[in-house]
């Protein structure tokens, strides 16, 4: 029975004229790897790594295909024609054959440089946006609570004149600074029993936000 899985570098991009490492890894099996074949998009051979015979590089690629690291392959002096699928085929004993796929996109030098130049500022801008969204959420939550507590206090002061003055406890726990609300629905403390348009809008806002913030912020779960 074949229990192993091939893990690959997946979809990768590299600069024209540069180099890239194609890497596959066989895991979850004790099978012995006897040979690894590397093939290009049209299934033409690039290289073979045999456990006993070493490496065989297809002659036409000898100048720009380097063996390794490990069972991987390094493609050098990349051209636009190198864009496409690459396959690693693992022959193993006793399992048999495993196959992995990698997609390589070769980018024009200017495009690659452009993307590299703007990648860091872009990440910074995204991080800033997340921080701003988080702060906005906190402000909305705090303001909404204040508004509600003011409303409750005015109602209570009216009630206290008519009744024994029993006070209603509303759980209140503000989000810690720099964190986001993990919201599957708008927190109950904000909407309570009200089901008006404003509350529905806020409900949707929190749902959208929860998708955007997952994995980017530390979560604070509020129960209402």
């Amino acid at each position: 029975m074949m229990t192993g899985t091939i893990e690959t570098t997946g979809n990768i991009s590299a600069k024209k004229g540069g180099s890239v490492i194609l890497q596959c890894h066989l895991s979850s099996t004790m099978a012995q790897v006897t040979q690894v074949n590397w093939e290009q998009h049209d299934h033409s051979l690039l290289a073979i790594r045999n456990a006993e015979l070493g490496w065989h590089i297809y002659p036409a690629f000898k100048d720009r295909v380097a063996p390794g690291p490990g069972l991987g392959l390094t493609l050098q002096s990349l051209t636009m024609n190198d864009t496409g699928e690459y396959f690693c085929t693992y022959h193993t004993y006793p399992d048999g054959t495993y196959r992995g796929r990698i997609f390589l996109e070769v980018l024009e030098s200017s495009v690659a440089e452009h993307s590299a130049r703007f990648q860091i500022p872009l990440l910074g801008a995204m991080a800033m946006m997340l921080v701003v969204i988080c702060i906005a959420v906190i402000v909305v939550v705090v303001l909404a609570r204040k508004k509600k507590s003011l409303r409750i206090h005015s109602v209570e002061s009216g009630l206290q004149r008519k009744s024994t003055g029993q006070e209603e406890q509303i759980p209140s726990a503000p989000s810690p600074p720099g964190s986001c609300v993990q919201a599957e629905a708008a927190p109950a403390g904000l909407c309570g029993e009200q089901q008006g348009d404003d509350c529905a809008e806020l409900h949707d806002y929190f749902n959208v936000l929860s998708y955007r913030s997952l994995g980017s912020c530390s979560f604070f779960t509020e129960t209402g």
Partner: antibody, heavy 119, light 107 residues
């Protein structure tokens, strides 16, 4: 076209050594491994070793380790096999062959050199 | 080592006949098998590699098939120049080994 030139027969004394050559032409010498194969009289073929002229690395059949040594001279596109401490068991035809495009098979063969070990 | 058992050791056939030679490696070699033809006093020549692929210069009457531990070389409509010795070779591990050969003779 691809050609592998091997010299004529060699008559050598037991205990001595011999250097066999194989001159390649008609292709990019460094791109293909060069193989050496032994064929004793009336017998089958035995792979000895191969060498990759690109990096000088060679792979041997364990049976011939210590008996054969492969080298290349890229400037003259020539492969060499040195056989030492010769005995009558080493009497055979020795072929050089260019490796295949797609693996460890032998795509083009030389005419062979007959080595006779005799006192 | 992977042992290559070739059969038959020899066979006689006439021009125009079809013949099949088989090769059985002692273990699974996938499709990493080649076939060679050697005429008397000449060096071997590649006929088939990777079990079924023919080099450009080889006539289409030759065909290879098989995988794992069972391979065969078929020659359709034998020609006078086809008589000689045939060898199989695996290219899947060290040492590379050849079969003992099949001698194809004219009947």
């Amino acid at each position: 076209q691809v050609q592998l030139q091997q010299p004529g027969p060699e008559l050598v004394k037991p205990g001595t050594s011999v250097m066999l050559s194989c001159k390649a032409s008609g292709y990019a010498f460094s791109r293909y491994s060069m193989y050496w194969v032994k064929q004793s009289h009336g017998k089958s073929l035995e792979w000895i070793a191969f060498i990759d002229p690109y990096n000088g690395g060679s792979t041997y059949n364990q049976r011939f380790r210590g008996k054969a040594t492969l080298t290349v001279d890229k400037s003259s596109s020539t492969a060499y096999m040195h056989l030492n401490t010769l005995t009558s068991d080493d009497s055979a035809v020795y072929y050089c062959a260019r490796g295949g495009d797609y693996g460890w098979y032998l795509g083009v063969w030389g005419a062979g050199t007959t080595v006779t070990v005799s006192s | 080592d992977i042992q290559m058992t070739q059969s038959p050791a020899s066979l006689s056939a006439s021009v125009g006949e079809t013949v099949t030679i088989t090769c059985r490696p002692s273990e699974n070699i996938y499709t990493y098998l080649s076939w060679y033809q050697q005429k008397r006093g000449k060096s071997p020549q590649l006929l088939v590699y990777n079990a079924k692929t023919l080099p450009e210069n080889v006539p289409s009457r030759f065909s290879g098939s098989g995988s794992g531990t069972q391979f065969s070389l078929k020659i359709d409509s034998l020609q006078p120049e086809d008589f000689g010795n045939y060898y199989c070779q695996h290219h899947y591990g060290n040492p590379l080994t050849f079969g003992a050969g099949t001698k194809l003779e004219l009947k």
